[in-house]
Each structure stands twice: as C-alpha cells, then as structure tokens.
Interface confidence: low
C-alpha cells in the first residue's frame, strides 16, 4: 500500500508541497508541511529521497494534508516531497510526487561573499555594484557601511544573491553584507568579510569583518526604522521572534513583498 | 479481528447533552479515518461526523454542526461524539465506523440514543 | 447535498430469480458503495468502489454505474439475501445515503 507506483503525470498530477513558517528555521522551531492536491484524495504521503515508503502519511478526505514536525533539528532537514492517492487507484498508486521541497534547520546560514562589479576601484563619477552572494535563494540582503550603524540598504531576491548600487561620488568606503530568512523566524547569516572600495589610485584590501572599526555586525530586522541593528549576541537566543527590517534609504530599497505562501 | 464497541447512549431531555464512546481494538486505530453514522427510527442513514486519523480534520453534516464534536484518542484506541443541544430528531442509533478509502468498511454494533421529554 | 434515489423501496423475488435495484445520484460521482443490513444488526459493507465485492460476499453479487446512475443486481435470488440495501456516496461531503431498497423473499 506504501510503495510509490508513480503513473504518467496527466493521470494523476502533482500536487504542491509547501512549509511554514519557512523552508529555511532555525533549530527547535515547529514546521508544518502543508500538501495540497489538485483533487480531493484520502491518503496524503509525506517522502524522503531513497525511501519508498512515506515518511509520515495523514489520511484526510480533502485536498490539503498537514504534517507536523515538531522542535525541528538540523538531521530533519533535507529534501521532501509528498504525493496523495485514492484507494481507487490501486495498490500502491500514487500520485505525481510534488517539486522538492528543502528544509534547512540549522542555527546560522553560511556566510556570503561580497564583490564589487566591475571592481572595487572607482573611477570619479562612476558607480559601482556591490553583490552579497549567499546560496540560497528568496532571502533578505542587507548591506552595511563602516562607521554606519543602520543598514544601508536592503533587497529581498528571488536570486541566491542581491545588488546593491552605489553612486560612484560616495562609493568608497569599507563595506559588509548578511543575509537572514525573509519571515520570521528570520535565520540570519554570518557577516561577509568586509569589501573595501576605493578610488583609482588607492589600493583595496580585504579585512576579516571582526577587525573593521565602527561596524556593527548584523542584527534582526528591527522593527523601526529608526531602530539600531544590534550585536549577534543580542538576538541569538533561540526561539525569539524577530521583526522585519524596515528600509532605511528608500530610493534603494526593493519594496516588492516575498512570494506569498499559497498554502496559507 | 477488528472490532468497534459503542457505549455512553440513553434518554436525554430535549436541550440536553450526551458524549458516546467507541473503544477500537484489531487495527492500527492511529492510522484510520473515522466516523460516527446514525440510524433513525424509520431505518434511514445519516453520515454525522468524520475525523482524520490524527484528529486535526473533523467533518460534519450541517444538521449537526456547532452541535456535535468528533474527536479521538488514539492513545487510547478511542473515538467519542460530544452531543449538545439535542433535538428530538436526534433519536437513532449511533454506529461508529471504521473509513475504508472512500467508504466505512466496519461498523460497530451501534448505541442508541432516545431525545425526549 | 448529493441526494441519492433508490428504487424500488420495496421489492420482493423468488429464489433463482435476477435482482435488480438501482441508486441515482443528484450530481455525478466517481464511484458509488453499497451496504447490506439484515433486521437488527448493523449495516455491512457489500459492494464498495461500484463494482469491488467486498469480503465474504458471493460472486452472484455485482454492481456497475457511473456518473449519476448505479446498480446492485443479485444474478440468482437465494434466502439470505433479504435483507435492506442502501447505496452511498463517500466522493464529497456531506456523505449521503440513499434510503434503502428492502428486499423481500417471494
């Protein structure tokens, strides 16, 4: 009854696999992954890749199954995907599985890195694109400038990255990037290394983000705009809910909310 | 063997209340759907209640919404039917069923419940 | 609701004789379920999925249908067979059943 005999996908199609809160938590947060099919079904199955049985199945005469999993840890992380069925079909039948679905528990997103485009020596008059590369995408960017409390600028991308530009008159500087979890609760990165733009004739070097003076290192979106961005150690408890980051520069700032969950 | 055992039924006045238990036993009662099906004094059917093998789905008719809870146990293998603001018309027989797929496949042998002043 | 019509309510046959009675549906389904309950005991599910025996019932059972028109026939009338049929949809809530065909031993 439990092994996946998948038939051709106009039989049966896929349905949609979503989490929430987020597909990226940190450790201890309980997730729901929610299962919706295109018809009414009575079986939903929750998969792991190399398993042929389900992870977790819910019987329920709709076409949104919830599973549970509480206190997530990072082993529960990984790739899902979830299919439905109707004892009709047969034994074994199975829907179309859903597109993965990957889950990241984990404590800290692995650091970006920040580049400038074309390089990180102006020219008078010239801008210049600061990218914060992380490896996930639909994330929140945050770009920081030394000796500048409040972020800088913000960008939320569909992309595993975000440019920030910088008018080339007050480009120089030392800069650091984050990147944190669009929604709470936000799963913040560690701080890129520090990314120096000079002008022509002034040698860039890179400095550890520890040793830039004056630098805040990356906080939790603060609620007012006018808020500080605290220290680490201020928001790492876990569990703690943060707020959203709201802009601090307008004129660069992506106003476009996340993708919505359509499982919500 | 699979078996599903009724109790709590009785008179109850108009207005009152009443909650039935069904004690499952010969399966994974954690795994089914289940349901609670009433007969009335004139042999008709009636699907009152359903609820999803973990509990968090619960389905009724609306002759009974707001008026009846389904819930379960599954520690305990036992599904019940909290009945408030009876009606007359709730006289029957109260089967609880075991979900199949898309049909109940076992029934209990039924409890009965008599509303009436 | 989906109501579902069974006729005839009554009926009665001969030992050896083909029965038939038949459940329509309000709106279309994808399969109907048929129970058998004999006086005092509790239904029993007969035909599940329109046509799928269930277990322990006789070969000389069948069903068919689709859409809004379904049937249970008996291919030989025998004594045991008397008893109240009621057809059912599990396809959409609210689940309904139909009101029975009471069949009688001629």
């Known amino acids: 009854d439990i092994t996946p005999s998948v038939p051709p996908a106009s039989y049966h199609p896929k349905p949609w696999l979503g989490a929430q809160p987020a597909t990226v938590v940190t450790p201890g947060v309980n997730v729901t992954l929610r299962c919706r099919a295109p018809q009414p079904a009575w079986r939903f199955g929750l998969f792991k890749p190399g398993e042929i049985a389900p992870l977790l199945f819910r019987d329920v005469s709709s076409e949104l199954a919830e599973f549970f999993l509480e206190e997530v840890t990072p082993a529960q992380g990984g790739i899902y995907r979830c299919c439905y069925r109707r004892p009709d079909w047969g034994p074994g039948v199975w829907s179309q599985p859903s597109d993965v679905l990957e889950l990241l528990v984990t404590e800290e997103l692995p650091r970006p890195s920040l580049v400038a485009l074309p390089g990180p020596v102006v020219g008078p008059g010239a801008n210049v694109s600061l990218r914060c590369a992380g490896r996930l995408r639909n994330m929140s960017f945050v770009l920081y400038r030394e000796g500048v409390a409040a972020p800088l600028q913000y960008r939320h991308s569909a992309q595993p990255w975000a440019d920030f530009t910088l008018l080339g008159a007050r480009a120089p500087g030392t800069y650091s990037c984050y990147y944190h979890t669009p929604s709470a609760p936000y799963v913040l990165s560690q701080r890129s290394e520090v990314l120096v733009i000079s002008w022509e004739g002034e040698g860039p070097e890179a400095r550890p983000a520890s040793s830039a003076p004056g630098m805040q290192a990356p906080g939790p979106p603060p609620s007012d705009p006018g808020a500080q961005a605290p220290s680490l150690s201020s928001f790492r408890p876990r569990g703690l809910v943060l707020q959203p980051l709201l802009p601090q520069t307008q004129d660069s700032w992506d106003p476009a909310p996340p993708p919505s969950d359509p499982g919500v | 063997d699979v078996k599903l055992v009724e109790s709590g039924g009785g008179l109850v006045k108009p207005g009152g209340s009443l909650k039935l238990s069904c004690a499952a036993s010969?399966?994974?009662?954690?795994?089914?759907?289940m349901s609670w099906v009433r007969q009335t004094p004139e042999k008709r059917l009636e699907w009152v209640a359903t609820?999803?093998?973990?509990?968090?789905?619960?389905y009724y008719p609306d002759s009974v919404k707001g008026r009846f809870t389904i819930s379960r146990d599954n520690a305990k293998n036992t599904l019940y039917l909290q009945m408030s603001s009876l009606k007359s018309e709730d006289t029957a027989m109260y089967y609880c069923t075991r979900e199949g797929g898309n049909s109940p496949d076992y029934w209990g042998q039924g409890t009965t419940l008599t509303v009436s002043s | 609701e989906n109501v579902l019509t069974q006729s005839p309510a009554i009926m009665s046959a001969s030992p050896g004789e083909k029965v038939t009675m038949t459940c329509s549906v309000s709106s279309s389904i994808s399969y109907m379920h048929w129970y058998r309950q004999k006086s005092f005991t509790s239904p029993q599910l007969w035909i599940y999925d329109t046509s799928k025996l269930a277990s322990g019932v006789p070969g000389r059972f069948s069903g068919s249908g689709s859409g809004i028109s379904y049937s249970l026939t008996i291919s030989s009338m025998e004594a045991e067979d008397v008893a109240t049929y009621y057809c059912f949809q599990g396809s959409e809530y609210p689940l309904t059943f139909g009101a029975g065909t009471k069949l009688e031993l001629k």
């Open positions: 609820i999803s093998s973990g509990g968090s789905y619960t």
């Open positions: 010969g399966f994974t009662f954690s795994s089914y759907v």
